[in-house]
Amino acid sequence: EPHSLRYNLTVLSWDGSVQSGFLAEVHLDGQPFLRCDRQKCRAKPQGQWAEDVLGNKTWDRETRDLTGNGKDLRMTLAHIKDQKEGLHSLQEIRVCEIHEDNSTRSSQHFYYDGELFLSQNLETEEWTMPQSSRAQTLAMNVRNFLKEDAMKTKTHYHAMHADCLQELRRYLKSGVVLRRTVPPMVNVTRSEASEGNITVTCRASGFYPWNITLSWRQDGVSLSHDTQQWGDVLPDGNGTYQTWVATRICQGEEQRFTCYMEHSGNHSTHPVPS
């Protein structure tokens, strides 16, 4: 499970006019960590755990950096040409990670009205964009704006990659990141599928970290990959995660099937309710 620092900035426009202020949230290892409200950015520690460990210097530095990034993002939103009337949002999510093998990752993602349209690997500078023509038009528009001054862009992206990792390392060193394990709650449900068949779904929720193995077994043997459907591992808003796996089985054979869960070295099996 890598250590991660995630910045989420949002700016708004109304009838083509970019609004002042912005919203910023920072997550450390998936936990809410800092927040700036819309009008006046003052980085606030999310919870006593953050405030206790880090001093005022941290909040001053984060406030300064987030304010600068918010200004940049407002300028970017102003350059999006196809803004229709009404309310629109531009969101920038920046993530950096340090993995167990000490390898690092840094990426940046832009969303317009909640739709991803442009990503960049900040370490390698590779840009990627979804295939839809709307996303590609937006992406080229924003990218060209960001590339207008190549030297500025170069400094900007490398600074973001380095700064994010530097902050993450600083937080790790300070001891603010306390590794913890929260075991999942596992719940198995069944529903009618078609005549003679039922769909059984195994849900795991409230777990941390996010790595989990969830699969269906028949007579103790794992079912093949293509006979099972998996949900994404998603944050549930409480700093923990949730996911599910489902398969279709013959009615009357429920007792042969179990859901197998493995998380942080612990494992358990869960039968289908009759």
Epitope: T104, R105, N121, E123, T124, E125, E126, K147, K154
Partner: antibody
Framework: QVQLQESGPGLVKPSETLSLTCTVS?????????WNWIRQPPGKGLEWMGF???????KYNPSLKSRITISRDTSENQFSLKLSSVTAADTAVYYC????????WGQGTTVTVSS | EIVLTQSPATLSLSPGERATLSCSAT???????FHWYQQKPGQAPRLLIY???NLASGIPARFSGSGSGTDYTLTISSLEPEDFAVYYC?????????FGQGTKLEIK
């Protein structure tokens, strides 16, 4: 049609500097992508050496970092590799390639390090 | 650095058979930065599959790719004589970019 072509001496003496150039046609090296050098010793696998990106940023393989320099000449649409203090272990086919998933490659040039 | 390990090192199959090549990483890789190449003797490698599952230009549909995290697979559904070559996986998630050591697909 994007094309890449490596050029440079095929024989380099030990302790000297290996110099290669990749000439790109059909695409501007300042528009996008990373412009890479990759090598393959005889009978062995591929090793990424480094790149110069569209913005001019360079990234190198740490295993070569003290010896490698990649530069570009935007007016000629070329990028170059210099590898100093070469030994017999640097004998390889040297390729230039475009991108991050390397979609276009040069045909490769064989460089032998020998006295 | 992220080390990629390909298996098997050599795969001996006959034309018409299905080939499955694996690539395992020491650290998680984003699927959009994972690629496969084919190399024939005396030639430069050529991009086969990019971003885990997308066929590169001119590559026949018998080639397919899948995977996520640390485990990736290249599948050739029915081998043609021209498919016998060396196959390399590559990650572009983090610097240095790295390749697997290669899988040699040979005629049985």
């Amino acid at each position: 049609q994007v094309q890449l072509q490596e050029s440079g001496p095929g024989l380099v003496k030990p302790s000297e500097t290996l110099s290669l150039t990749c000439t790109v046609s059909g695409y501007s090296i300042t528009s996008d992508y990373a412009w890479n050098w990759i090598r393959q010793p005889p009978g062995k696998g591929l090793e990424w050496m480094g790149f110069v990106s569209y913005s001019g940023t360079t990234k190198y393989n740490p295993s070569l970092k003290s010896r490698i320099t990649i530069s570009r000449d935007t007016s000629e649409n070329q990028f170059s590799l210099k590898l100093s203090s070469v030994t017999a272990a640097d004998t390889a086919v040297y390729y230039c390639a475009r991108g991050y998933g390397f979609d276009y490659w040069g045909q490769g040039t064989t460089v032998t390090v020998s006295s | 650095e992220i080390v990629l390990t390909q298996s098997p090192a050599t795969l001996s199959l006959s034309p018409g058979e299905r080939a499955t090549l694996s690539c395992s990483a020491t650290s998680s890789i984003s699927s959009i930065y994972f690629h496969w190449y084919q190399q024939k003797p005396g030639q430069a490698p050529r991009l086969l599959i990019y971003r885990t599952s997308n066929l590169a230009s001119g590559i026949p549909a018998r080639f397919s790719g899948s995977g996520s995290g640390t485990d990736y697979t290249l599948t050739i559904s029915s081998l043609e004589p021209e498919d016998f070559a060396v196959y390399y996986c590559q990650q572009g998630t983090t610097i240095p970019f790295t390749f697997g050591q290669g899988t040699k697909l040979e005629i049985k």
